[in-house]
Every structure is written in C-alpha cells, then in structure tokens.
C-alpha cells in the first residue's frame, strides 16, 4: 500500500523521481558502452517522513521502530518501485551489440 | 547481479541482516493484533560502500553519480531483496482471523 | 527476432496523401533509445533518410520534405505511421522503416512499393 | 546536408580477393558512419556502426575503417554471396545522407 503522498517537509523535499545527467565516463562506462554518449539517469531521492509512500508493512514498521530507536533502526529509504527500460550499443570482441537493461533507470518511487 | 559481498568497512559494517525484537505497542498494533505479542524483525540495516551488494544497473549507477556528486546523489541503501512471510492473530469485529503478510519480515538484503 | 513490415496504398493519384504503416516486433517503442525511421529509395535519388521518432516521441524529419511530412506512433499496438501530403511522381520509390537503437539503424523492413500515376 | 560520394558506382572482383569500398563525407563527421549491404531485391542489411565496429552476426571479412571525411569498407576474402551494393550513410548531424552506393560485382 503506498500512503501519503503528501510531503509534510515541504514541496520537492520527500522521496520522489529526479533526472541527473551523465556522461559514459562519469558513469565509468566510456570503455564498454559506444551509445548513448549521455543517460539522463531517472533516481529516486528525497526523505521518507512517517508513513510517507510506504511501499509495504516492512516500511510501516521500519518507520514505527525508527521512531523508538532511531540510533539502531534507519529511516525507510527512497528507492524505486519499478523501471523503464533502456537500450545501450554496447562494444564487443567483435563489434558491437544491442542489449536492453530493465533495470537502469527508475520509474517511480516509494520507501523502504 | 549481487556484487562484492566483502565489506570495506569491517565485520557487520555492511548491509545485511538484523533482527529486532518489538513489542505490539512499540509497532503501533497493540489495538488490533492480539498474537504474536512480540515480534523478531528482520530488517536490512548497513552501510552500502561501492558496488557492496549492488541489486542491479540502477544501484551501480548510482554509487558512480554518488561519488562524483555527493550531496546531489545519495548512496545506494540496503533495503530487503526478499521477504519471509508471517502469520497475525489480528482482532475483528466479531472476533479474530488469520491473517498472512508476506511483506513483513526482510529474507536477505541488498543495496539500491 | 525483430521484424519490421511496411504497408502503403501501392499507388495514388498527384496530389493525394500517403499514409503508410510500419508494423513491428521484437522490440518495443517503450524503450528508451529506440525509435522507428522512414527511408525511401528511388532509382533516381538512391535513398533518402526521411524521419524518424523516438520512445519519448522526439520527432525529426528531412528538411527538404518537412513540410509535407507528419511520423506518429501507436506504443501500444507496436506501429509507427508516416503521412505524405500532395503526393508527386518525385515520390514514386519504395518505402522501408528501419528500427533505431539511439543513432543505429540496425533492421530494416522488406519495403513496400508505392508510385504515383495520374 | 553532409553529401556522402562514394565515387565508384561499379567494382569488379573475384572470390577469395580483398576490395575496399569507399566513401567520402563532404565535411568532418567524427566517426558517425554506418555501412549498409543491398543484396539485389532485398532490403538494405546493417553491416557497420560508427565506422568501425561490425555488427553481431556480420562475417568479420567485413572491416570499416575512417574518421573524419574519408572511409572504407574492405571484404576480404571476397564470397559469391557479398554481391551487392554497399550504401555509407552519416549519422553526424540532420538530415541524415547517404551515399549513392557502390555495386560489387563478381567476376
């Protein structure tokens, strides 16, 4: 169950999609991906205040026993709840290749 | 793909496993789950240092931008990569029901 | 495997328009990087890139026919359309759609045969 | 528009010979070069990407090499089945142009 969805910490500052831009070489790819020469990276960043975009009940307690024992137990944490896939042109030992990752750029978010 | 499972950082540093135990009253549920009444969590706590347990594509890319840009990009964070189920006696209104989760208990861990 | 088709009225009449479809699978247009483009091929021009478009829909067209050309997509029913207004014998060619991963244009379809008589 | 010239239309050759294909790009276009084959009544089949790197599936008797305005495509080891024409094409810059292709003709 995802729950609020309001941000109580104010506009933009909750777990939420953001797009960073890089280059192969700032993602260390430059020697084995040919295209696209820039990803615009989709990630999820932002806080997870009580029960805000809970993904599930483990977030729920993860929330309640941060609250008792915040020294020992961390806050829920802003990840992706899916992804769109991506297409990369990659080098091989004979030339190159096409291949799909499903797992590279977040969709959208929740915490956990 | 799960990464290095050796941790930089030293013994029990990383993101792995823990168990908490929690009453009914420290989750929140002491109104409307009569068994069990205190519950070994497991949940995934540690730090995620570069490609430790790394889940996918998504998480090395984001300990790439996290190094290059640190206060735009968060670190990887040890989430659950997999759940154990678990049953609660919950109260209804005419009496109690069995009730499964299968959210509730982290399995094994991993960084995204 | 992948597989693209193209299908078209095969002939029409000067200023008429073509519609042409491009049907295809093994690949999806949800994808980020691919894209789907249109290129004809004339024995007297040779070919000609003519547009392409892309998963997020960024649309791009050859400026000499710009005007006359609309590319569109359906995602879901795995299809791209290319329309061709005021049609003249000069369009008389055959037409191929060509997936795109980024900037390669790595299969291509059959090609369908389309001339323009009066 | 970027012409692409590839300024022999017909090259004749035998099986088991080695021939380069060429092509010339009227302003620098970086390494931004495909390399298509046309075998008679088919579509036209990728062989290239960025000038150099073959695509799976592609016999490595075909070499692209070039940067800037001027590239090859070479066969070595020529096979009756590489009768064809071998279209270069720049992906450089909008609209994308082709050259007028090369026929390989097998003696």
């Known amino acids: 169950a995802r729950n609020g969805d309001h941000c109580p910490l104010g506009p933009g500052r909750c777990c939420r999609l953001h797009t960073v831009r890089a280059s192969l070489e700032d993602l260390g790819w430059a020697d084995w991906v040919l295209s696209p020469r820039e990803v615009q990276v989709t990630m999820c960043i932002g806080a997870c205040p009580s029960q805000f975009r809970a993904a599930n009940m483990h977030a729920q307690i993860k929330t309640s026993l941060h609250r008792l024992k915040p020294d020992t137990v961390p806050a829920p944490c802003c990840v992706p709840a899916s992804y769109n896939p991506m297409v990369l042109i990659q080098k091989t030992d004979t030339g190159v290749s096409l291949q799909t990752y499903d797992d590279l750029l977040a969709k959208d978010c929740h915490c956990i | 793909a799960r990464n290095g499972d050796h941790c930089p950082l030293g013994p029990g540093r990383c993101c792995r496993l823990h168990t908490v135990r929690a009453s009914l009253e420290d989750l929140g549920w002491a109104d409307w789950v009569l068994s069990p009444r205190e519950v070994q969590v497991t949940m995934c706590i540690g730090a995620c240092p570069s490609q430790f347990r790394a889940a996918n594509m998504h998480a090395q890319i984001k300990t790439s931008l996290h190094r290059l840009k640190p206060d735009t990009v968060p670190a990887p964070c040890c989430v659950p990569a997999s759940y154990n189920p678990m049953v609660l006696i919950q109260k209804t209104d005419t009496g109690v029901s069995l009730q499964t989760y299968d959210d509730l208990l982290a399995k094994d861990c991993h960084c995204i | 495997q992948v597989t693209l088709k193209e299908s078209g009225p095969g002939i029409l009449q000067p200023s008429q328009t073509l519609s042409l479809t491009c049907s295809f699978s093994?690949?999806?247009?949800?994808?980020?990087?691919?894209?789907v483009d249109w290129i004809r091929q004339s024995s007297g021009k040779g070919l000609e890139w003519l547009a392409h478009?892309?998963?997020?829909?960024?649309?791009r067209y050859n400026p000499s026919l710009k005007s006359r050309l609309t590319i569109s997509k359906d995602t879901s029913s795995n299809q791209v359309f290319l329309k061709i207004t005021s049609v003249d014998t000069a369009d008389t060619a055959t037409y191929y759609c060509?997936?795109?991963?980024?900037?390669?244009?790595?299969?291509w379809g059959q090609g369908t045969s389309f001339t323009v008589s009066s | 528009d970027i012409v692409m010239t590839q300024a022999q239309k017909f090259m004749s050759t035998s099986v088991g010979d080695r021939v380069s294909v060429t092509c010339k790009a009227r302003?620098?276009?970086?390494?931004?070069v495909a390399w298509y084959q046309q075998k008679p009544g088919q579509s036209p089949k990728a062989l290239i990407y960025?000038?150099?790197y073959r695509y799976s599936g592609v016999p490595d008797r075909f070499t692209g090499s070039g940067s800037g305005t001027d590239f090859t495509l070479t066969i070595s080891n020529v096979q009756s089945e590489d009768l064809a024409e071998y279209f270069c094409?720049?992906?450089?810059?909008?609209?994308?142009?082709f050259g007028g292709g090369t026929k390989l003709e097998i003696k």
């Open positions: 960025s000038a150099s």
């Open positions: 478009i892309y998963w997020d829909d960024d649309k």
């Open positions: 093994g690949f999806s247009l949800t994808t980020s990087g691919m894209g």
């Open positions: 094409q720049q992906y450089n810059s909008y609209p994308y142009t």
């Open positions: 302003q620098n276009v970086g390494t931004n």
């Open positions: 060509a997936r795109r991963a980024w900037d390669a244009m790595d299969y």
